[in-house]
């Protein structure tokens, strides 16, 4: 619940570049949390929701300590591209129940796109390959029902929230090693 982030300063210092990526990630994390809370208020969720088309969570016990910057950035970019597709799909196919959240979903999409551009810039600065997703992109069909789209929204926002937390923790940890 913080104020919106301003535009990060472009720099040739990798720590500063990483910093601006962390800033955007934290900012998007706050937005996602707020939107997930709104979703819970409007459409109370019963338990954990999952969606097979979402990326598997990137972090498990022990993996953070052995992270390397190229791996984190590549994985993060691939996962966020998937979440971007899912947010776009929600906006397009979410149905009337999610129309009330359209401004927030639109803002979330814009933030996601901005973070992806920042990651792309950071990867090109570090001369890292712009990796394509491992698996073929599965087309997302329309939700089976209005409740299906609500469950999907819960799953997408919950997964994005956890992915962004992993990203902030991973990037800040890597920054201490630069």
């Amino acid at each position: 619940p913080g104020p919106p982030a301003g535009s990060p300063r472009v720099s040739s210092d990798p720590r500063a570049d990483l910093d601006s990526a962390v800033l955007l990630t934290r900012s998007l994390l706050a937005d996602t949390r707020q939107l997930a809370a709104q979703m819970r208020d409007k459409f109370p969720a019963d338990g954990d929701h999952s969606l097979d088309s979402l990326p598997t969570l990137a972090m498990s016990a022990g993996t953070l300590g052995s992270l390397q910057l190229p791996g984190v950035l590549t994985r993060l970019r691939v996962d966020l591209m998937s979440y971007l597709r899912h947010v776009q799909w929600l906006r397009r196919a979410g149905g009337p129940s999610l129309k009330t959240l359209e401004p927030e979903l639109g803002a979330l999409q814009a933030r996601l796109e901005r973070l992806l551009r920042r990651l792309q810039l950071l990867m090109s600065r570090l001369a890292l390959p712009q990796a394509a997703p491992d698996q073929p992109v599965i087309p997302l069909g329309p939700p089976a029902s209005a409740w299906g789209s609500i469950r999907a929204a819960h799953a997408i926002l919950g997964g994005l929230h956890l992915t962004l937390d992993w990203a902030v923790r991973g990037l800040l940890l890597l920054k201490t090693r630069l």
């Epitope: 619940p1 913080g2 104020p3 919106p4 982030a5 301003g6 535009s7 990060p8 910093d19 800033l23 990630t25 934290r26 900012s27 994390l29 706050a30 949390r33 969570l57 972090m59 498990s60 016990a61 022990g62 993996t63 953070l64 929230h161 956890l162 962004l164 937390d165 992993w166 902030v168 923790r169 800040l172 940890l173 920054k175 201490t176």
Partner: antibody
Framework: EVQLVQSGAEVKKPGASVKISCKAS????????MDWVKQAPGQRLEWIGD????????IYNQKFTGRATLTVDKSASTAYMELSSLRSEDTAVYYC????????????WGQGTTVTVSS | DIVLTQSPASLALSPGERATLSCRAS??????????IHWYQQKPGQAPRLLIY???NLDSGVPARFSGSGSGTDFTLTISSLEEEDFATYYC?????????FGQGTKLEIK
Amino acid sequence: EVQLVQSGAEVKKPGASVKISCKASGYTFTDYNMDWVKQAPGQRLEWIGDINPHQGGPIYNQKFTGRATLTVDKSASTAYMELSSLRSEDTAVYYCARGELGHWYFDVWGQGTTVTVSS
Amino acid sequence: DIVLTQSPASLALSPGERATLSCRASKSVSTSGYSYIHWYQQKPGQAPRLLIYLASNLDSGVPARFSGSGSGTDFTLTISSLEEEDFATYYCQHSRDLPPTFGQGTKLEIK
């Protein structure tokens, strides 16, 4: 009511290990990180590390890397901190605290567990 | 690591007075609209309690007499009119980078 309840006081000999538990209730355990903070007599509060209960990935303050081990039991909504190779300067109150994802501020704290290291 | 220095180390005031506590960081803890400073209150034998997060946001249940301000390296916790229960030790903490660190505390005592 949101609360964190920690295990009781411990007295240990130098070189031994201690494992402290922290039972969460009143909120969704996996929605927040669980952080651990040390408060030694006359010293400032010191962040040890945190763990994301959903994914189980801990991160540590470099000062505690190798000696502190953070784990969770999701099904029991309980977090654990184990500290090994204890020395006298580990004598302190250890707190678990609920951490906001990505922001590291702590809005709910356990009551603290006093660990005394003495030969 | 970022070092936080609080001043004064102790402060003696009377109920009803205004208290101003300072926290200075060894490097900026603000960035594009966010200031990663948080304030806690701790009473003897108790755990710390979050008062203010991200420099100026009041945590739920915290009385409105508490407020936080500042940016960059200089931050202030203000208690507009002291109540008996406000006499305690106050800590600032940053989360700009890893690891988060705490100030050494300011002890607020009854005059």
